[in-house]
Interface confidence: medium
């Protein structure tokens, strides 16, 4: 039940990449508005996105305070223009979200190959340490700052002239691989958190190939 023309939100869904975290829901409001609340299991409810006609709410500022906590959100529905009005039980209609643990569930953003450098038959490939929205002491922390050794990268590399891929792994942001002299190679990387059960891998980075601007080559 509830006040006339007010319906509860449904399909509450967390959308999160590199800790940028948005709660989405349905339906598009007709003569109603929403307010979102977020809490940890043991904490108090904090209200966000007051009386909005949007069907999404950016909760990043709350979840980055402690990315290892488990969060729960709820979306309240109010009649437009009469937000004091409540349902028959004396409170507005609301719907709970699924639980969300940012550290375990945020999607890993698409990585970027920062540079590669060839020295003889070795190539050093460096992955950009992407910035997250986790802020500490006046700076935004990088993915490596937050995940530490839980985060690894997988490098896929192949000769430009063939399609046979090789792989390498690192728990830093750098790879050092052996290549054949005189051959050009292409590279793509993927971020991985092996210990996770969901959202374990990012999408692959854009492909970068030797002989293009990004690399640096020194024959020694």
């Amino acid at each position: 039940s509830g006040t006339t023309n007010t319906v509860a939100a449904y399909n509450l869904t967390w959308k999160s990449t590199n800790f940028k975290t948005i709660l989405e829901w349905e339906p598009k409001p007709v003569n109603q508005v929403y307010t979102v609340q977020i809490s940890t299991k043991s904490g108090d409810w904090k209200s966000k996105c007051f009386y909005t006609t949007d069907t999404e709410c950016d909760l990043t500022d709350e979840i980055v305070k402690d990315v290892k906590q488990t969060y729960l959100a709820r979306v309240f529905s109010y009649p437009a223009g009469n937000v004091e009005s409540t349902g028959s039980a004396g409170e507005p209609l609301y719907e709970n979200s699924p639980e969300f643990t940012p550290y375990l569930e945020t999607n890993l953003g698409q990585p970027t190959i920062q540079s590669f450098e060839q020295v003889g038959t070795k190539v050093n490939v460096t992955v950009e340490d992407e910035r997250t929205l986790v802020r500490r002491n006046n700076t935004f922390l990088s993915l490596r700052d937050v995940f530490g050794k839980d985060l690894i990268y997988t490098l896929y590399y192949w000769k430009s002239s063939s399609s046979g891929k090789k792989t390498a792994k690192t728990n830093t942001n750098e790879f050092l691989i052996d290549v054949d002299k005189g051959e050009n190679y292409c590279f793509s990387v993927q971020a991985v958190i092996p210990s996770r059960t969901v959202n374990r891998k990012s999408t692959d980075s854009p492909v970068e190939c030797m002989g293009q601007e990004k690399g640096e080559f020194r024959e020694i």
Epitope: S42, K65, D66, V67, Q69, D129, R131, V134, R136, N137, T139, L141, S142, R144, D145, V146, G148, T172, N173, E174
Partner: antibody
Amino acid sequence: EVQLVESGGGLVQPGGSLRLSCAASGFTFTEYHMSWVRQAPGKGLEWVGFIRNRAQGYTTEYAASVKGRFTISRDNSKNSLYLQMNTLRTEDTAVYYCARLTMVVAEFDYWGQGTLVTVSS
Amino acid sequence: DIQMTQSPSSLSASVGDRVTITCQASQDINKYLNWYQHKPGKGPKLLIYYTSTLQTGVPSRFSGSGSGTDFTFTVSNLQPEDIATYYCLQYDNLLTFGQGTKLEIK
């Protein structure tokens, strides 16, 4: 195995200078924030300052008590952290520790054994 | 800089006791407060971060609470191995340790 080894401590007169070093091994040095923490005789821990990692541009922050007198730097090619201490005061007398800092939860997860700095005339 | 006032500076308790240490910040630090345990000859060890989150592997007899400017650290069922000096550390704006609390067993 992660290791941090400080050196460079000793006796110095008030107004003098000293440079401490911390040799790091067992981890990818450029990926970590590094900090100095000190402990005066019979007193508690005091954070001195830190230098951020490569992703954060190796920027520095200092406690108010040392700002303008102390400078933290790092030589990544040598896996070394430094603390340049100028205009030293008697209250700077302490054991100085270098520590690896995990910023997301402000955890000093590895510590050196410390080096004693005595400022006295 | 933010100042942290920790009390008491020392306390003595018996095995099995419940002990409480408090820390007060000179300004609102949200919940950005940690508790460290420091034993002689060892590096300080993080027990609790973000006021109340237990670090992995830390026994559940350690707990923390608070927000804003007032924080509490509790050891329930005190054990002999808990003899140490305990420090709070704020990390809302730079880093500041409390003065420390030396915990002894009666």
